[in-house]
């Protein structure tokens, strides 16, 4: 039985340079308890894009659009996109602990950047 699903509905998103990119993610349960974080790339060299609890992410805002009972919205918007922002973005659920441990990742959304 699946305990929880992390759903990134968009396999890819294309955004013009200078515009904002919305990266969608919904999660089907708060259990196991623990935070949601966004990363660009996978593996040990991945880059933290957003963590609500700590850090400063001036280009990122949260975008909660879903009012459905069956899931919760953990989508983000990244402003002023540049070609350097291209890559695959992952919405990742962690299980609370010391330290928190990765529990489940979404399938990823590939962001491509078009010229203005």
């Amino acid at each position: 039985e699946e305990e929880l699903q992390v759903i990134q509905p968009d396999k890819s998103v294309s955004v013009a340079a200078g515009e904002s990119a919305i990266l969608h993610c919904t999660v089907t349960s708060l259990i196991p308890v623990g935070p949601i974080q966004w990363f660009r790339g996978a593996g040990p060299a991945r880059e933290l894009i957003y963590n609500q609890k700590e850090g400063h992410f001036p280009r990122v805002t949260t975008v909660s659009e879903s009012t459905k009972r069956e899931n919760m919205d953990f989508s983000i918007s990244i402003s002023n996109i540049t070609p350097a922002d291209a890559g695959t973005y992952y919405c990742v659920k962690f299980r609370k602990g010391s330290p928190d441990t990765e529990f489940k990742s979404g399938a990823g959304t590939e962001l491509s950047v078009r010229a203005k």
């Epitope: 305990e3 089907t28 708060l30 196991p32 308890v33 949601i36 909660s64 919760m72």
Partner: antibody, heavy 118, light 112 residues
Framework: EVQLVESGGGLVKPGGSLRLSCAAS????????MSWVRQTPGKGLEWVAT????????YYPDSVKGRFTLSRDNAKNSLYLQMNSLRAEDTAVYYC???????????WGQGTTVTVSS | DIVLTQSPASLAVSLGERATISCRAS??????????MHWYQQKPGQPPKLLIY???NLESGVPDRFSGSGSRTDFTLTINPLQAEDVATYYC??????????FGGGTKVEIK
């Protein structure tokens, strides 16, 4: 129609044990996070325990941690709360409640009364 | 622990008028722009019943005279217009990712 039916409440002496059960019907039990919430006239509503849909993860407030154990049997659509080392302050109406997303409590049973007294 | 303070503890409102209940959290219950604050109605001898989930979403089957609003630490449940069957005690509840989950102390709504 969703139904949650609690049983197992009663009078027990301090230090004693009780096992509460909750029989679920009318929904896909194995997809739901399940919890117990208790209510006393003095303290109001208090969250007591939560278990993940597959039964892997359990959570308790400090007030019951180490004394209460929550489990489930998805094949039987049943939830169980084993309560040990009971104290007078555990006296309450205990409600079984479902949480589709592990967030709000969607459905509640009618409750079962636990009285801890010598 | 996140403490939820409801006010007033009791409220008497005339039929057809507006009833407003406040719930203040000791710290934010918002995650990614969603407020994990919920409202329940409890009538004597009955279990609580979900009215509003995640601050402002009306649970299926609940009359639209009930509404919820607020974010971060300040939340409101409004009943407008109040009807006789709304006499009950109302509770707020937070389910942020910081355990333990907690409830407000309740607000008893009566008819003036």
């Amino acid at each position: 129609e969703v139904q949650l039916v609690e049983s197992g409440g009663g009078l027990v002496k301090p230090g004693g044990s009780l096992r509460l059960s909750c029989a679920a019907s009318g929904f896909t039990f194995s997809s739901y996070v399940m919890s117990w919430v208790r209510q006393t006239p003095g303290k109001g509503l208090e969250w007591v325990a939560t278990i993940s849909s597959g039964g892997t993860y359990t959570y308790y407030p400090d007030s019951v941690k180490g004394r209460f154990t929550l489990s489930r049997d998805n094949a039987k659509n049943s939830l169980y709360l084993q309560m040990n080392s009971l104290r007078a302050e555990d006296t309450a109406v205990y409600y079984c409640a479902s949480q589709l997303t592990g967030s709000e409590f969607d459905y509640w049973g009618q409750g079962t009364t636990v009285t801890v007294s010598s | 622990d996140i403490v939820l303070t409801q006010s007033p503890a009791s409220l008497a409102v005339s039929l057809g008028e507006r009833a407003t209940i406040s719930c203040r959290a000791s710290e934010s219950v918002d995650l990614y722009g969603t407020s994990f604050m919920h409202w329940y109605q409890q009538k004597p001898g009955q279990p609580p019943k979900l009215l509003i989930y995640r601050a402002s979403n009306l649970e299926s089957g609940v009359p639209d005279r009930f509404s919820g609003s607020g974010s971060r630490t300040d939340f409101t449940l409004t009943i407008n217009p109040l009807q006789a069957e709304d006499v009950a005690t109302y509770y707020c509840h937070q389910s942020s990712d910081e355990l333990p989950w907690t409830f407000g102390g309740g607000t008893k709504v009566e008819i003036k």
